[in-house]
């Protein structure tokens, strides 16, 4: 004969207001013959939740026909939860007995606490772009969650990261409770196409966490390298002279050439490529008039990137014809 | 088999005493109760009292009250009632009845019954 | 006391019939009725309980409704073997208590 286990398997039992919570209760024996009754809480003030064989309880139905011989599910639903509703249930086997019926054994109890589910994180990135090698700082928020356990994550591409600090407030007992976390990430020149990603893990999400997500290039200024090239054949009394910029982002940037430090108008053409890593390249060709009579042309390509301090790399021409060294030079 | 097992027919004298046994096999005694129910002839169902086989707690008819003893012996599971100070009214058959209901009481083992007479 | 009354206190039936015994409880006693069938010389033996639960290994021609003060017991067509006393039981309380019986015979 087996002895009778009252088997109430959630330890915890998060609701939501309004919804329906079903506490489940399983016995592994019908003997001895009896009822089995649900409390909240326990000793002489234990409120009766449900007994099937008299009283009224409109929002709790059982899960099973609780008049079938064999029926060992005596599971329990209670309908439209309110505040009011939580504590500690337990089922309690009963024998007969007389002129009452006697306590068996109870179940181990099942804690009903309310639940709610935390927000879509929100991550926000630094206010200013950086360039790489340095660091900057993400923070993420989520709100409105309980119980006040919760497990926040951060992710580089995929990667974890650990260099961040969390706080959720409020420290105390609360109806609802907020998560704020601040990552410090590290930028490298390719994190244009980079993401960071704030994962939230909280019980009421049924192991299906919550993420918030910024992009990278949203923070990143990678600027750009120049280089000033003169093309070896000439056209007449012209030399074609381009300058390349490349990878820098973001996409803003203004260009300006001069002449013996006299600025140009005019500009050939120029092309705007983009990299696989999200940066870009910009190419400007200048077509500058020379006359063998004139002995030294400087031209300055100056590049004005995402609002910063002008960057600029000259080229001395070179209008010999049977000269082939080019000399050039930068200036910040 | 699950089953109840009653004791033989008994006649006897109006005063006298009367102890009918009911042994169950089959199952977990002491797990259910086990109720006694007499049928006086051409009559219907007259329950007497119920007693738990499991703390030998008893419940009996207001009307038999202080004639009648119910026990139980779980070493042999078997359960007895005894019915005092016969009267020619208390002629029947008398059944034992396994009572089997959760909330409830309903019985769904009897035995046999024991026929007892009484007569001067 | 529970007092439960039983109608008709007989009927005469024919074999493929539906016959239709219904029970009165006093006072409410919500699905705890029983109903049983029993045969001259014979022990009770349980048709139905908690009103409508039909026990194990009785025929699903026997059924049972109701509940509160008012029960109901059908064989939805009589067989041969069916020719008995029935007898309702609430087990809602102590003292249990059994309505007085109805005798189907053959008509």
């Known amino acids: 004969e087996e002895e009778l286990q009252m088997i109430q398997p959630e330890k915890l039992l998060l609701v939501t207001v309004g919804k329906t919570a079903t506490l489940h209760c399983t016995v592994t024996s019908l003997l001895p013959v009896g009822p089995v009754l649900w409390f909240r809480g326990v000793g002489p003030g234990r409120e009766l939740i449900y007994n099937q064989k008299e009283g009224h309880f409109p929002r709790v139905t059982t899960v099973s026909d609780l008049t079938k011989r064999n029926n060992m599910d005596f599971s329990i639903r209670i309908s439209s939860i309110t505040p009011a509703d939580v504590g500690t249930y337990y089922c309690v086997k009963f024998r007969k007995g007389s002129p009452e019926n006697v306590e068996f054994k109870s179940g181990p109890g099942t804690e009903m606490a309310l639940g709610a589910k935390p927000s879509a994180p929100v991550v926000l990135g630094p206010a200013a772009r950086t360039t790489p090698e340095h660091t900057v700082s993400f923070t993420c928020e989520s709100h409105g969650f309980s119980p006040r356990d919760i497990t926040l994550k951060w992710f580089k591409n995929g990667n974890e990261l650990s260099d961040f600090q969390t706080n959720v407030d409020p420290t105390g007992q609360s109806v609802a409770y907020s998560i704020r976390s601040t990552a410090r990430v590290v930028l490298d020149p390719w994190d244009v196409r980079s993401q960071v990603i704030c994962e939230v893990a909280h019980v009421t999400l049924q192991g299906d966490p919550l993420r918030g997500t910024a992009n990278l290039s949203e923070a990143i200024r990678v600027p750009p390298t120049l280089e000033v090239t003169q093309q070896p054949m000439r056209v007449g009394n012209q030399v074609n002279v381009t300058c390349q910029v490349r990878k820098f982002y973001p996409q803003s940037l203004q260009l300006t050439w001069s002449e013996n430090g006299n600025v140009c108008q005019r500009e050939t053409a120029s092309t705007l490529t983009e990299n696989k890593d999200g940066t870009y390249n910009w190419t400007s060709w200048f077509l500058v008039n020379i006359s063998d009579q004139r002995d030294d042309v400087v031209l300055t390509c100056q590049v004005k990137h995402d609002g910063q301090l002008a960057v600029s790399k000259r080229l001395a021409l070179e209008v010999t014809v049977h000269q082939k060294d080019q000399s050039s030079d930068a200036t910040p | 088999q699950v089953q109840l097992v009653q004791s033989g027919a008994e006649v006897k004298k109006p005063g006298a005493s009367v102890k009918v046994s009911c042994k169950a096999s089959g199952y977990t005694f002491h797990g259910y109760g086990i109720s006694w129910v007499r049928q006086a002839p051409g009559q219907g169902l007259e329950w007497m009292g119920w007693i738990s086989a499991y703390s030998g707690e008893t419940n009996y008819a207001q009307k038999l009250q202080g004639r009648v003893t119910m026990t139980t012996d779980t070493s042999t599971s078997t359960a007895y009632m005894e019915l005092r100070s016969l009267r020619s009214d208390d002629t029947a058959v008398y059944y034992c009845?396994?009572?089997?209901?959760?909330?409830?009481?309903?019985?769904?083992?009897w035995g046999r019954g024991t026929l007892v007479t009484v007569s001067s | 006391d529970i007092q439960m009354t039983q109608s008709p206190s007989s009927v005469s039936a024919s074999v493929g019939d539906r016959v239709t015994i219904t029970c009165r409880a006093s006072q409410g006693i919500s699905s705890w009725l029983a109903w049983y069938q029993q045969k001259p010389g014979k022990a009770p033996k349980l048709l139905i309980y908690?009103?409508?639960n039909l026990q194990s290994g009785v025929p699903s021609r026997f059924s049972g409704s109701g509940s509160g003060t008012d029960f109901t017991l059908t064989i939805s067509s009589l067989q041969p073997e069916d020719f008995a006393t029935y007898y309702c039981?609430?087990?809602?309380?102590?003292?249990?208590?059994f309505g007085g019986g109805t005798k189907v015979e053959i008509k």
């Open positions: 908690a009103a409508s």
């Open positions: 009845a396994r009572e089997a209901g959760s909330s409830w009481y309903d019985f769904d083992l």
């Open positions: 039981q609430q087990g809602a309380s102590f003292p249990i208590t």
